[in-house]
Amino acid sequence: MAPWPELGDAQPNPDKYLEGAAGQQPTAPDKSKETNKTDNTEAPVTKIELLPSYSTATLIDEPTEVDDPWNLPTLQDSGIKWSERDTKGKILCFFQGIGRLILLLGFLYFFVCSLDILSSAFQLVGGKMAGQFFSNSSIMSNPLLGLVIGVLVTVLVQSSSTSTSIVVSMVSSSLLTVRAAIPIIMGANIGTSITNTIVALMQVGDRSEFRRAFAGATVHDFFNWLSVLVLLPVEVATHYLEIITQLIVESFHFKNGEDAPDLLKVITKPFTKLIVQLDKKVISQIAMNDEKAKNKSLVKIWCKTFTNKTQINVTVPSTANCTSPSLCWTDGIQNWTMKNVTYKENIAKCQHIFVNFHLPDLAVGTILLILSLLVLCGCLIMIVKILGSVLKGQVATVIKKTINTDFPFPFAWLTGYLAILVGAGMTFIVQSSSVFTSALTPLIGIGVITIERAYPLTLGSNIGTTTTAILAALASPGNALRSSLQIALCHFFFNISGILLWYPIPFTRLPIRMAKGLGNISAKYRWFAVFYLIIFFFLIPLTVFGLSLAGWRVLVGVGVPVVFIIILVLCLRLLQSRCPRVLPKKLQNWNFLPLWMRSLKPWDAVVSKFTGCFQMRCCCCCRVCCRACCLLCDCPKCCRCSKCCEDLEEAQEGQDVPVKAPETFDNITISREAQGEVPASDSKTECTAL
């Protein structure tokens, strides 16, 4: 991809809007709705063209005073102060607060429910395919294939617990060794981080919000990818996870525990089970090569069944096949034995929407996928809106300080570790890292939590989900206890190893720097976020899967040159930023490459053309769809009939565009792509008050 995407020159155009550099008041003759800015009003106005908002190629003068786009926005309280209100006003304000809290909890509830249904939808659409990935015999010998299968299956079923439970059942059935299962678990860890990345896409309407939200979500992705990048080769070489966990499992005489407490599910299940109920055993059965399961539907029809155990006489080829010598007889021709047979009698149908439709899984899955994404998007918008109205002034200051401030010296370093514990605890409570990190994403977006603080919370979430798995393993039946516990411990120690790699020393906190870099690129070229999602969670795993199926030689033949080029580019990039004089003049920058190889600008033009056909059709999108629309089109202006998009359009027209000068980017991993970025002060995309 582009090592250093460039900024293009903007040709003046009298018909286009004008924009002042730095923080000046923009002059737009036709516009009456302008918001006066007080910062830098004395500075000379340099009028340059503001291209339509869907185009990201704009020449921006270097501002006199630079705002860090990663600084948290100040949420100004425009309302009347509490002390200035009369009794009636105070009562009204109090009830408004209560109402907002109820609404917030309500939307949060439906947000979590929609995540659950999204997972069900993914399982209906890709669950059977996911199960078939597991039945590939090459997993045993190829850890890379195991890894990508873990990623793909978890992405397809939107649940790492589903994919790990399949792995556990395969290990306890001796279809898979623990050694072969470890890369799959690593892959599942990566796959589970797609959920909050999808959630972050819902905040695409506001660039600065999107920058933070997307970076906050992808910090999880980068942590997982980097951990795998280092720990998979280490595991293949040393088998340290397998050895450590085996020692632990063998040294303790575990008794079967109780099931991990279902805390959040207790609240969400009554609602989600009215929408759809799935028979998740089908995926496991497919994974275990059960031919009959391939024709079964994942949609649960019968919820109340009567199981009648009875003994039937069956013929066996020889007396050796008898259940026991005493249960063996002959009729003079055939040998017979008695077999316990379980007859399942259907009594009552499930009470969910799709129970009587008899639609194929793909159809149900598609319907649920669209609906759950719409609800997810709608809830997210409303959560952000309510939080935006609640977290203002004093409240915001207190919350921000509480969450983002470190302990006093010399205990400042402990704050992050406390955040890890909080993340683990919260995830344990909600029983899902996806739910926790997805709930965190909008908070990062609106600027309540910094990425630096979200990072340890996310790492804690990774730990929390493994402790849940350990508890679940302890509740497993005897035959599955050892394998499920060992796999849960592998998962746990993998995350611990990852934390030790990428957290204790601030210099090693690469995921934060990479996520910020990606956040900057995605805020500028919003289509790149979708591109990133497809590439990292689908194309790369599918390519590796395909090459692995073709055999080791093909995989190595293609993989080695690709890895070599990546390493070469990274080394060159490092030398360019640290000691360019070592390099020949030609290699001191990327200008020797054609523009499409070093910049996203030509690609942006292609995407803009491609999405151009959607721009007019966007117009009648509803408020909830608006952000999804804007993601596709990158064009808030086209959604003219949508109130939130009109607000966005006006806000962007009346906005200054300060950008960091190249030297102010202290982080070498942040792409120069971001240097032509729209600011953190980019206006809110929110519609008017509730």
């Epitope: 006489n313 007396t319 010598p325 005493s326 249960l327 063996c328 007889w329 002959t330 009729d331 003079g332 021709i333 040998n335 017979w336």
Partner: antibody, heavy 120, light 107 residues
Amino acid sequence: QVQLVQSGAEVKKPGASVKVSCKASGYTFITYNMHWVRQAPGQGLEWMGAIYPGSGDTSYNQKFKGRVTMTRDTSTSTVYMELSSLRSEDTAVYYCASSTIITTGAVDYWGQGTLVTVSS
Amino acid sequence: DIQMTQSPSSLSTSVGDRVTITCKASQDVGTAVAWYQQKPGQSPKLLIYWTSTRHTGVPDRFSGSGSGTDFTLIIRSLQPEDVATYFCQQYSRIPLTFGGGTKVEIK
């Protein structure tokens, strides 16, 4: 009612063969196994083998393997038992017996028996 | 082959007496044992199968018990018409095998 009618007594020379028939009536012939049991004078019962008329599947006592052949004719609901290479110790009453107690080797209906005498 | 050893080989008792005939299998046959009654000059007749299940039309004075290798046929109150030879049979393995028989007479 169930009836198994066997062919009449036979006198054979050693080394010869004998073919005993058993005609079934009163039940669905092809459904139940037909067994052949012999009883030497003043001795106990000895199972020779069985045939399933539905498919013609047979099972023989290893002691008679190669000498005994059981066949059936579904059109006449008749089962045949042929014993070759007769010896004097083969002198016995040969019974055909049907097992209508499904899946068991317990024989509930017996023919009247056919006396086969092997004498030089 | 499974050997079925019957005892006694013969017994003489009075009408109304309780008669017990035992049968021992050379290996575990579960409950796949049947008992037959053969009157002089007649074909055998099934009395009991599955160790203790009476065949249709068999008087309830006949009962069977046992499992594994030891089996018993009991005639609770001997009647004159019960004079016959009694055979046990296993149908656990091919070939089916019969006991040597127990001849029951009235004094």
